[in-house]
C-alpha cells in the first residue's frame, strides 16, 4: 500500500480502539460541480432496459434514504417498443458505504457498513445453456 | 422526519463541533451475504451498451480504490453484433459517500464527501434532434 506521512496537525485520538474508531465531519463536501443532473434523470424511462426507482428508508442509516432500481421487464425494449425476450434486463449493482448508528438510536456514533444497491438496469445477451 | 429516542448507552461527545463531528467504527459490517458476485461480473461485456472499468485510486480517500465505468461505444450493439447509431450508450451515474482524510494525511480524521461515479452503461433513445 501507499504510506502517507502523518500530518503533525492531526487530532489526537485517545480512543482505545484507535485506529478502528475515527472522527468524521458530517458537513458533506460535494465534488459533483460540473454535472448536469437533468442528463441522466430520465434514463430510467428511455433505456431499452427501463427501471423503476423504489425508496428505501432507514432512520438508523446515513444516508437514511436510498433509491433502489428494479428492472421493469424481464426482456428489453426493441425498436418497435415491444419487449424482446431474446434479451434480458438486468440490474447493475454497486457496493456502497453507509453509516449505521451503533449503538442503535445514537446520534453521534456510527459503524461503517457495506451494502449492495441496484443503480439502474442494462440489457444483456443471455448465456444460453442447453440442458442435456 | 422520524424522531428516534436517544439510547442512554450512547458515547458522550465533548467535541465542540458536535453533532457535526461523530465517531465512526471502521470495522466494516458487510450486509451483502446472499449475493453471487459472479452473476453481475460480466454484464460489462454482455451488455448492448458494454463498458470498461477504470481503477481510480486516491490514498486520501476511503475507500481508496473506486472502479469507474466508461462506455465502450457511442452507439449500442445490435442483434448482429454491430454498433447501431440510432441508439446511444450512456453511463448510469450514482452519488456515493466516501471519507476524505481531513486534515490531509491524517489516519484518524475524515470528512464525508459526496462523489458521482459511473457504475455501468445502459442503452437509450435520445429525446430529439438539434435544439435551437
Amino acid at each position: 500500500g501507499i504510506t502517507i506521512p502523518r500530518n503533525p496537525g492531526c487530532p489526537n485520538s485517545e480512543d482505545k480502539n484507535f485506529p478502528r474508531t475515527v472522527m468524521v465531519n458530517l458537513n458533506i463536501h460535494n465534488r459533483n460541480t460540473n454535472t448536469n443532473p437533468k442528463r441522466s434523470s430520465d434514463y430510467y424511462n428511455r433505456s431499452t432496459s427501463p427501471w423503476n426507482l423504489h425508496r428505501n428508508e432507514d432512520p438508523e442509516r446515513y444516508p437514511s434514504v436510498i433509491w433502489e432500481a428494479k428492472c421493469r421487464h424481464l426482456g428489453c425494449i426493441n425498436a418497435d417498443g415491444n419487449v424482446d425476450y431474446h434479451m434480458n434486463s438486468v440490474p447493475i449493482q454497486q457496493e456502497i458505504l453507509v453509516l449505521r448508528r451503533e449503538p442503535p438510536h445514537c446520534p453521534n456514533s456510527f459503524r461503517l457498513e457495506k451494502i449492495l444497491v441496484s443503480v439502474g438496469c442494462t440489457c444483456v445477451t443471455p448465456i444460453v445453456h442447453h440442458v442435456a | 422526519g422520524i424522531t428516534i429516542p436517544r439510547n442512554p448507552g450512547c458515547p458522550n461527545s465533548e467535541d465542540k463541533n458536535f453533532p457535526r463531528t461523530v465517531m465512526v467504527n471502521l470495522n466494516i459490517h458487510n450486509r451483502n451475504t446472499n449475493t453471487n458476485p459472479k452473476r453481475s461480473s460480466d454484464y460489462y461485456n454482455r451488455s448492448t451498451s458494454p463498458w470498461n472499468l477504470h481503477r481510480n485510486e486516491d490514498p486520501e480517500r476511503y475507500p481508496s480504490v473506486i472502479w469507474e465505468a466508461k462506455c465502450r461505444h457511442l452507439g449500442c450493439i445490435n442483434a448482429d453484433g454491430n454498433v447501431d447509431y440510432h441508439m446511444n450508450s450512456v453511463p448510469i451515474q450514482q452519488e456515493i459517500l466516501v471519507l476524505r482524510r481531513e486534515p490531509p494525511h491524517c489516519p484518524n480524521s475524515f470528512r464525508l464527501e459526496k462523489i458521482l461515479v459511473s457504475v455501468g452503461c445502459t442503452c437509450v433513445t435520445p429525446i430529439v434532434h438539434h435544439v435551437a
Epitope: 442528463r39 | 457511442l74 447509431y85 440510432h86 450508450s89 434532434h129
Partner: antibody
Framework: QVQLVQSGAEVKKPGASVKVSCKAS????????MHWVKQAPGQRLEWMGG????????SYNQNFKGKATLTVDTSASTAYMELSSLRSEDTAVYYC????????????????WGQGTTVTVSS | EIVLTQSPGTLSLSPGERATLSCRAS???????LAWYQQKPGQAPRLLIY???SRATGIPDRFSGSGSGTDFTLTISRLEPEDFAVYYC????????FGQGTKLEIK
C-alpha cells in the same frame, strides 16, 4: 458561440504518423461527442469515427479501424485524431465536427464543423 | 452499408430560380437520421436540415427538406447568390454515409 479550431496543415512522408488537434470553445466540451470526417480530393465525405469525451466511448467506421485513433484531453477541451502508417491515399482534408449530447440529441447528429486540416502524404 | 446517390451531379440555375436536389438511398433510411449540408469552396460543411425536414439554427426558410424511406429532397425556393455551393445528404443507422454531392452552379 461554438467554435472548433483545428491545427495547421501537415506534410508527411509515407509510413509516418500525424496527429491533428481540434480545440473546442463556446460550449461544455464534456457534454457533446466529437467526430472526424475525411474529404479526399474528388471523393465524397467519409465519416471516420466519433468519441464521447465524458465516457471515453469511441465508435469507428470499419474502414478506419487500425488507421485512425481518436482521443481527447478534457482539461484542454481538445480532441485529437492520429493517423498511422500514412500512405498517399490518406492525403485529404480532415474535419472535426461536434456531435450530439446523447440526451437532447443523438451522439451522431453533427452540427458544427472545424475549418479542416490538410494532410499531404508525399515522398 | 447504405449508399446515398445524389442527382443531378451538377445543377445550373440562375438566382431567383427554384432548386430541387434529390438523394436516393440504397435501402430505407429513417427520416429522423437524414441530414443535408452545404459546402462552399475552401470551407467546412454547414448543417442545413436534420431529421429530413427540420431546419438547423440560423438557416433561412427558403431551404426545406422532405421525403421518407429511400427518397429525400432538398428544395431551395428562391436562389440567392450565396446559395451556389455543393450540397451533401447524409444518413446514419447501421452505417454512417454521405452522398457524393450535387454542385449547384450559376447558369
Amino acid at each position: 458561440q461554438v467554435q472548433l479550431v483545428q491545427s495547421g496543415a501537415e506534410v508527411k512522408k509515407p509510413g509516418a504518423s500525424v496527429k491533428v488537434s481540434c480545440k473546442a470553445s463556446g460550449y461544455t466540451f464534456n457534454e457533446y461527442t466529437m467526430h472526424w470526417v475525411k474529404q479526399a480530393p474528388g471523393q465524397r465525405l467519409e465519416w471516420m469515427g466519433g468519441i464521447n469525451p465524458n465516457s471515453g466511448g469511441v465508435s469507428y467506421n470499419q474502414n478506419f479501424k487500425g488507421k485512425a485513433t481518436l482521443t481527447v484531453d478534457t482539461s484542454a477541451s481538445t480532441a485529437y485524431m492520429e493517423l498511422s502508417s500514412l500512405r498517399s491515399e490518406d492525403t485529404a482534408v480532415y474535419y472535426c465536427a461536434r456531435g450530439g449530447d446523447g440526451y437532447y440529441t443523438n451522439y451522431f447528429d453533427i452540427d458544427y464543423w472545424g475549418q479542416g486540416t490538410t494532410v499531404t502524404v508525399s515522398s | 452499408e447504405i449508399v446515398l446517390t445524389q442527382s443531378p451531379g451538377t445543377l445550373s440555375l440562375s438566382p431567383g430560380e427554384r432548386a430541387t436536389l434529390s438523394c436516393r438511398a440504397s435501402q430505407s433510411v429513417s427520416s429522423s437520421y437524414l441530414a443535408w449540408y452545404q459546402q462552399k469552396p475552401g470551407q467546412a460543411p454547414r448543417l442545413l436540415i436534420y431529421g429530413a425536414s427540420s431546419r438547423a439554427t440560423g438557416i433561412p426558410d427558403r431551404f426545406s427538406g422532405s421525403g421518407s424511406g429511400t427518397d429525400f429532397t432538398l428544395t431551395i425556393s428562391r436562389l440567392e447568390p450565396e446559395d451556389f455551393a455543393v450540397y451533401y445528404c447524409q444518413q446514419y443507422g447501421s452505417s454512417y454515409t454521405f452522398g457524393q454531392g450535387t454542385k449547384l452552379e450559376i447558369k
